[in-house]
Amino acid sequence: MAVTACQGLGFVVSLIGIAGIIAATCMDQWSTQDLYNNPVTAVFNYQGLWRSCVRESSGFTECRGYFTLLGLPAMLQAVRALMIVGIVLGAIGLLVSIFALKCIRIGSMEDSAKANMTLTSGIMFIVSGLCAIAGVSVFANMLVTNFWMSTANMYTGMGGMVQTVQTRYTFGAALFVGWVAGGLTLIGGVMMCIACRGLAPEETNYKAVSYHASGHSVAYKPGGFKASTGFGSNTKNKKIYDGGARTEDEVQSYPSKHDYV
């Protein structure tokens, strides 16, 4: 029951996280104009990964896409790539995890298969969350660098010219959405990985009798059958044959057809 709850909660948390990553990627407020000490109040500018928007004092708002690829900073392209990779991995992870959910029955899918799928989706969610966090952090670092460069330019002047009045940009709402969403996706992925361990059926010992006919002496031994999940070392249901009184965890040998009476 706890495993099902952990898996279900991991799925829901990851779903919210990935929805947040998609929302952040599409948002226009990745950077917003810093209003402090800015003499220009007629316009307020905010920018996203895909377009720039201006809200004017008249209330009129206009947005324009960045129609050039070559003119954009490599860092912006890297952030775009990280966010898209995060979304794609998260979407695939969601798809896989739906089929892996313990509460959903699909054909005669074994628990071992569900456990594998849960682990796969969990890893995908973790990588997706890390991509989003990395993307947002790279963008934030770019803003901080740009902010201090602009501040320096304001007071020292650019290229020997007189003081430059340059618009500075600060963190927009999308950065916080991205960080939280990436964190949720990461947590959801960890929960899925934890759930995977509980989904893997434990090896169960069945009491049985096996015997090994070696010459004239016959030795009987209890606990001869071992059921396996496919996750342990004993990957096939093997009969354990023994000539002496050894424990079943010791070296095992495959039976031959002559061992059966």
Epitope: V40, A42, S52, V54, S58, Q166
Partner: nanobody
Framework: QVQLVESGGGLVQPGGSLRLSCAAS????????MGWWRQAPGSQRELVAI???????QYGDSVKGRFTISRDNAKNTVYLQMASLKPEDTAVYYC????????????WGQGTQVTVSL
């Protein structure tokens, strides 16, 4: 790259008028403002007036009611009509285009001298 060419500066008597113009050539990102800033010797650069691509206008406190800014989007040109000039309006007037492409860009003209004196 954007080049700005200013014209119209000169010597004028107090109470007189002058018209500055600034033509921008090159590729300018669609969202922007064009405007005028001035810098008197020993002081910081201050806002005179700006006209945005969307039609909004803003004036600096010291020139409100005396100066008028206009903009021709088709020609990428901005004009500053200065009236009732005072000696304190003496400064180098700089044309500025600020584009709102990614993280913004500022382009500046070389400046034109305006001297208000008897």
């Amino acid at each position: 790259q954007v080049q700005l060419v200013e014209s119209g500066g000169g010597l004028v008597q107090p109470g007189g008028s002058l018209r500055l113009s600034c033509a921008a050539s090159g590729s300018i990102f669609g969202l922007n403002f064009m405007g005028w800033w001035r810098q008197a010797p020993g002081s910081q650069r201050e806002l005179v007036a700006i006209a945005t691509s969307g039609g909004s206008i803003q004036y600096g406190d010291s020139v409100k009611g005396r100066f008028t800014i206009s903009r021709d989007n088709a020609k990428n040109t901005v004009y500053l009509q200065m009236a009732s000039l005072k000696p304190e309006d003496t400064a180098v007037y700089y044309c500025n285009v600020h584009t709102y492409d990614f993280l913004g860009r500022d382009y500046w003209g070389q400046g034109t001298q305006v001297t208000v004196s008897l």
